[in-house]
């Protein structure tokens, strides 16, 4: 059977090294040899290379070599598949090899600030050597933070034939590590050059950023202070480099800046007792080159009455992330602050807080929050320099089975009943919500039964027992992730019962 | 224009040698391989061979082999085909001619030298 | 070499004839076959590539067709203008070779 016609023919120009063909099929049903024609210097040569016959058959590529390989040229490439039965032609294929030249990478050698310009970097490389040394080379830099698996890109050409060439990449962010890589190509060329080396520059530091600021409002103390929590951190886009020297806080009641009292702290929190009035906060962060932009906060009256928007909150879970979502009854509120922290029995240890614009849902990653930890999610809503009432919520990124069952007790034995109690288990032992509990309980060599109530449910008479009879007792507490056993407890029905017995004894 | 322009006629001796010349204008021969027919009535076309004026690589036609010698210089843009111990076989007429390989053909052909070996 | 045995060596036809020359390669030459025109006292035209490809500027009337070992020329209406010599050449591998000729005469 003749073999396949050749096709799918694919040539690539290696500036200086080769060029290459290759074509599909690339495995043939029996031994196949093949023979590419080539014509060059614009159709007037032309040769022809083989794929060997024993050590390269069935090879669907072959390689022309230098000193032929001239350029600029068009080059015509026909390829015959041979075997015992006969030969089969491909179509003939053009190539300009201007369009099809792949050439070296280039070699960036720096990537610097320009000291006073802010928010660029200076990229410097040495155009590759095996490159044609008049043409027009097109470049892709791309470039991303240090700590972003996210690359962008910006093209440009390049027509100057110094070796050494650079490149200004602006509008990035102020003290930030950028790593960079570049490839290029001849400007008519489809074929890029592979990815240079990466090299890493920082932009140059600038006054801090910004801050966002938070508060959490305590109750007032027994002399009538009341103490506020104050909390701020970079603000979101601010610079990873970024480092401040302190922070300056300075606050006030409303409309009386006289009473304006100040802090220098180091600290990203600090608590201030303030009165019963409205009072305003700013703070600023600063570093050697300046201060960052004022961040506000108005506290409100202590009996001032707060607004209240969100109707309704959810909070679901998907493969890798907790979404918290609500529905809201005033449209002009679009900003929204998140407050987020483990319900332990002790102090939270870990208050984390974060703002939301122009959404009414909020995502975080399921490993920044503990597996089996309940977490209190609150979200408050902020109309300019108010903030209304909060919504919250409960969850948890991953349920277990509780770490212990509930303890039980059996009340009110009877001949035929008794009143069973149980405690609920200490939120650190529960691993997610508790959906419900069942009381397995057993007469001795007898058939276990069942009983399941609901979560709210710490109670339960059992009826319809066999008088004068031992049992078995436990109960179970359930989440979604499945159930654990409380202690294992035993109790006698009565064979008369007490009412019963003391009626007897009068008479 | 893209021409080749050859000598009219050559009469030579038997046994002796004569060397052709094939002055190309309009191309630049270094670009091309340089071919040579040679026409007899009865015979029809002959390849004799080729060379690459590029780097000076010539190939001949196994009967030609001994008997044609195909040389070029690219200062004058000129090839040359030797002839030696010439018999009255070598009587004919002989083209220079520049060949198109995408479509297979002799797209110029030179305007031909007749060769007539007579004592 | 490869040998390409062409006839018939003369051919004498009436304008309006169709003719047919057949050209046979001693081995496969797949498709690189060309066929030749060589009218008195000029060089050789390209006529036909590749077995069956119409140079630019050819009349239809001349058709090549074939593949391997076996090649046809037809004319399918003779001219008075196509009085010629036609050869056949493979440049398959080399060396090129060409047919002897058809020797095309108008009564």
């Known amino acids: 059977v003749l073999p396949a016609k050749p096709e799918n023919i694919s040539c690539i120009f290696y500036y200086e090294e080769n060029f290459t063909c290759t074509w599909s099929p690339e495995k043939e049903a029996s031994y196949t040899w093949y023979k590419v024609k080539r014509t060059y210097s614009y159709g007037y040569k032309s040769d022809i290379c083989s794929t060997d016959n024993s050590t390269r058959g069935n090879h669907a590529s072959c390689s022309f070599l230098p000193p032929t390989i001239t350029n600029p040229d068009n080059y015509t490439i026909q390829v015959e598949a041979q075997n015992a039965d006969g030969i089969m032609k491909s179509d003939i294929t053009y190539w300009n090899l201007d369009a099809i030249m792949k050439i070296e990478p280039p070699e960036i050698f720096s990537v610097k600030s320009v000291l006073g310009i802010k928010r660029m970097l200076q990229i410097k490389w040495i155009r590759p050597v095996l490159a044609p040394h008049s043409s027009t080379l097109k470049y892709t830099l791309r470039f991303r933070t240090i700590n972003s698996a996210y690359w962008m890109e910006v093209n440009f050409t390049k027509e100057d034939i110094d070796r050494d060439e650079t490149y200004n990449l602006t509008e990035l962010q102020a003290f930030t590590e950028y790593v960079m890589t570049l490839r290029c190509a001849p400007a008519e060329s489809m074929f890029w050059s592979g990815w240079s080396q990466e090299k890493v520059g920082t932009t140059e530091e600038e006054a801090p950023y910004g801050l966002d600021l938070w508060r959490v409002l305590k109750p007032a103390m027994v002399d009538g202070r009341r103490p506020v929590q104050l909390m701020w951190k970079k603000a979101t886009g601010a610079p990873v480099l970024e480092k401040a020297l302190g922070y300056n806080i300075w606050y006030f009641p409303e409309n009386n800046t006289n009473l304006t009292e100040t802090v220098n702290t180091t600290n990203q929190t600090h608590e201030l007792y303030l009165g019963g009035k409205t009072y305003w906060v700013y703070v600023v962060s600063y570093n050697s080159l300046g201060e960052s932009p004022v961040a506000t906060l108005r506290i409100p009256a202590l009996n001032e009455k707060t607004f209240q928007c969100i109707e309704a909150m959810q909070a679901c879970l998907t493969q890798d992330q907790l979404v918290v979502e609500w529905q809201s009854s005033a449209p002009e509120v679009d900003t929204w602050m998140v407050e987020w922290f483990p319900d332990v029995d002790s102090e939270p240890s870990s208050f984390s807080w974060e703002s939301v614009s122009q959404a009414r849902n909020w995502t975080i990653q399921k490993d920044e929050l503990k597996p089996l930890w309940c977490y209190n999610i609150s979200v408050y809503p902020v109309l300019r320099d108010r903030v209304g009432q909060p919504y919250s919520t409960q969850a948890y990124v991953q349920e277990g089975i509780p770490s212990a069952g509930p303890v039980t007790q059996a009340d009110s034995i009877g001949v035929k009943t008794v009143t069973i109690t149980w405690k609920e288990i200490p939120k650190s032992k529960r691993n997610g919500f508790i959906k419900n509990y069942t009381i397995f309980y057993q007469a001795e060599d007898g058939k276990e039964f069942s009983k399941t109530v609901n979560s709210n449910i710490l109670q339960y008479r059992l009826e319809s027992l066999t008088r004068r009879t031992s049992y078995s007792l436990q109960v179970m507490a359930s989440t979604n992730a499945g159930g654990t056993n409380g202690t294992k407890i035993n109790f006698k029905t009565l064979s008369i019962s007490h009412h019963h017995h003391h009626h007897h004894h009068h008479h | 224009e893209v021409q080749l322009q050859q000598s009219v006629a050559e009469l030579v001796r038997p046994g002796a040698s004569v060397k052709l010349s094939c002055t190309a204008s309009?191309?630049?021969?270094?670009?091309?391989?340089m071919h040579w027919v040679k026409e007899r009535p009865e015979q029809g076309l002959e390849w004799i061979g080729r060379?690459?004026?590029?780097?000076?690589?010539?190939k001949y036609a196994p009967k030609f082999q001994g008997k044609a010698t195909i040389t070029t210089d690219t200062s004058s843009n000129t090839a040359y085909l030797q002839l030696s111990s010439l018999t009255s076989e070598d009587t004919a007429i002989y083209y220079c001619?520049?060949?198109?390989?995408?479509?297979?053909?002799?797209?110029?052909w030179g305007t031909g030298t007749t060769v007539t070996v007579s004592s | 070499s490869i040998v390409m045995t062409q006839t018939p060596k003369f051919l004498l036809v009436s304008a309006g004839d169709r003719v047919t020359i057949t050209c046979k390669a001693s081995?496969?030459?797949?498709?690189?076959v060309t066929w030749y025109q060589q009218k008195p006292g000029q060089s050789p035209k390209l006529l036909i590539y590749?077995?069956?490809n119409r140079y630019t500027g050819v009349p239809d009337r001349f058709t090549g067709s074939g593949y391997g070992t076996d090649f046809t020329f037809t004319i399918s209406t003779v001219q008075a203008e196509d009085l010629a010599v036609y050869f056949c050449?493979?440049?398959?591998?080399?060396?090129?070779?060409f047919g002897s000729g058809t020797k095309l005469e108008i009564k």
């Open positions: 001619a520049r060949y198109y390989y995408v479509s297979s053909h002799f797209d110029v």
């Open positions: 309009g191309f630049n021969i270094k670009n091309t391989y």
């Open positions: 060379i690459d004026p590029a780097n000076g690589n010539s």
């Open positions: 081995q496969s030459v797949t498709n690189d």
């Open positions: 590749y077995a069956s």
């Open positions: 050449q493979q440049d398959y591998s080399s060396p090129f070779t």
